[in-house]
Interface confidence: low
């Protein structure tokens, strides 16, 4: 799967979305960073989102079918805090921070894991959680989003993600799929969908849908590997495509992305 040119910050500040902390038991989350990008770049990125969202609303008003066909899926892949762990630990990594694909085309949320022992068939679990805030609605008001981010910076909590961090009781939570050994089982809500876990832990949608927007958590469970960071998440956002999307988003690839 190719990585697009528009870089979104990842936790721990490293380009691959993870950083090794030498003192695992005491390691703490690091802020979400815009590496090499100043506030103007961030505002330009938010404006591009708003333009795309605006295109979606206009398209639905005039040509709803065409808007559906030409919709774009934006995937922000954000890595949970990653630390080195002592022996007998699982480390789960969601890589590739940002991808763009066309709606109804396949998308893969890559998830990798490392184990320090050899478990008997670790279980891979992908869960869906709806956004805590409406990302698309916020895209219509880039200034408010900017103000919100500035407020967070001022509050000394730049790593806070208002779209992801909230209690499960106030959002929808579903099991998408689980994999143990060679067998993949889809959650009840996703029965009939062409979704699977490929390789060891990548979540693959043969066709994306509007309702797929949300946060996807990849977790790996093993009775023999109890410590470490066994979960990472990816944000999947479905937006409308405007005719100028290629100019708005450097590195945009208008075609299916392979698993």
């Amino acid at each position: 799967m190719q990585q697009d040119g528009l870089g979104v910050g990842t936790r721990n500040g490293s380009g691959k979305g993870r950083s090794v902390h030498p003192s695992w038991p005491w390691c703490a989350p690091r802020p979400l960073r815009y590496f090499g990008r100043d506030a103007r770049a961030r505002r330009a990125q938010t404006a591009a989102m708003a333009l795309l969202a605006g295109g979606l609303s206009r398209g639905l008003g005039s040509h709803p079918a065409a808007a559906g066909r030409d919709a774009v899926v934006f995937v922000w892949l954000l890595l949970s805090t990653w630390c080195t762990a002592p022996a007998r630990a699982i480390q789960v990594t969601v890589s590739n921070p940002y991808h763009v694909v066309i709606l109804f085309q396949p998308v893969t949320l890559p998830c990798t894991y490392q184990m320090t022992s050899t478990p008997t068939q670790p279980i891979v679990i992908w869960k869906y959680k709806s956004f805590c805030r409406d990302r698309i609605a916020d895209a219509f008001s880039p200034a408010s989003v900017d103000n919100q981010l500035n407020a967070q910076l001022a509050a000394g909590n730049p790593g806070y993600n208002p779209y992801v961090e909230c209690q499960d009781s106030v959002r929808t939570v579903r099991v998408v799929a689980t994999k143990q050994g060679n067998a993949v089982t889809l959650g009840d809500y996703y029965q009939g969908r062409r979704i699977t876990i490929t390789g060891n832990a990548d979540l693959t949608f043969d066709q994306t849908a509007w309702g797929d927007s949300g946060v996807y958590y990849c977790s790996v469970v093993s009775a023999q590997d109890l410590q470490g960071n066994n979960e990472a998440y990816a944000e999947l956002i479905v937006l409308g495509r405007t005719s100028g999307v290629a100019e708005l988003l450097p590195g945009f690839q208008a075609g299916p992305i392979e698993d």
Partner: antibody, heavy 114, light 106 residues
């Protein structure tokens, strides 16, 4: 019980095309990756191609890259291997197999390119 | 390709170990499977998959283990009917992999 039944083998002409079909039963077909593996007479096993459970990801061995197409129909629980521009070295028994790390095999179908 | 010995021999009742190395480090872990072929042209039978998982119809004398990037198939109390060629299998991010096969003579 898991069963994998291959068909479509036989005598083939060099330069021609081959279409092998594997019919699966006894398990949730769409939940499993599927593979084609072949064995030339007197030789070892050679991985040919694989396809993910939903069908969106395909992989091919270097010997057939550019000549082979693997596809699947989850509604019919079938996986197909299309091999074009046949060569003498494509001769062998072709097996359909289940899983990324194979845990079940078909009985095989013999292909002779001559 | 995967590396495994060309042949091993044992007397009935003995314990046999066949090793395999060179598997792909796929998603940070090495995974292997083991397949038994009793005669050329006959269908292989999987005796171990995912390093140490044994299909329900395979006798318990077959077991698998992995240390680092090397996998081992162990047959405890080998029997005459275990005489066969054993292939190890693995995969990496782009391809399936097989060893050349180990001929077990009992």
């Amino acid at each position: 019980a898991v069963t994998l039944d291959e068909s479509g083998g036989g005598l083939q002409t060099p330069g021609g095309a081959l279409s092998l079909v594997c019919e699966a039963s006894g398990f949730d077909f769409s939940s499993h990756e599927m593979q084609w593996v072949r064995q030339a007479p007197g030789k070892g096993l050679e991985w040919v191609a694989g396809i993910s459970g939903a069908g969106s990801s395909t992989r091919y061995g270097s010997a057939v890259q550019g000549r082979a197409t693997i596809s699947r129909d989850n509604g019919q629980s079938t996986v197909r291997l299309q091999l074009n521009n046949l060569r003498a070295e494509d001769t062998g028994t072709y097996y359909c197999a289940r899983g990324s790390l194979i845990d079940a095999w078909g009985h095989g179908t013999e292909v002779i390119v001559s | 390709a995967l590396t495994q010995p060309a042949s091993v021999s044992a007397n009935p009742g003995e314990t046999v170990k066949i090793t395999c190395s060179g598997g792909g480090s796929y998603y940070g872990s090495y995974y292997y499977s083991w397949h038994q072929q009793k005669s050329p042209g006959s269908a292989p039978v999987t005796v171990i998959y995912e390093n140490n998982q044994r299909p329900s119809d395979i006798p318990s004398r077959f077991s698998g283990s992995k240390s680092g990037s090397t996998a081992t198939l162990t047959i405890t109390g080998v029997q005459a009917e275990d005489e066969a060629v054993y292939f190890c299998g693995s995969y990496d991010s782009s391809a399936g992999l097989f060893g050349a096969g180990t001929t077990l003579t009992v």
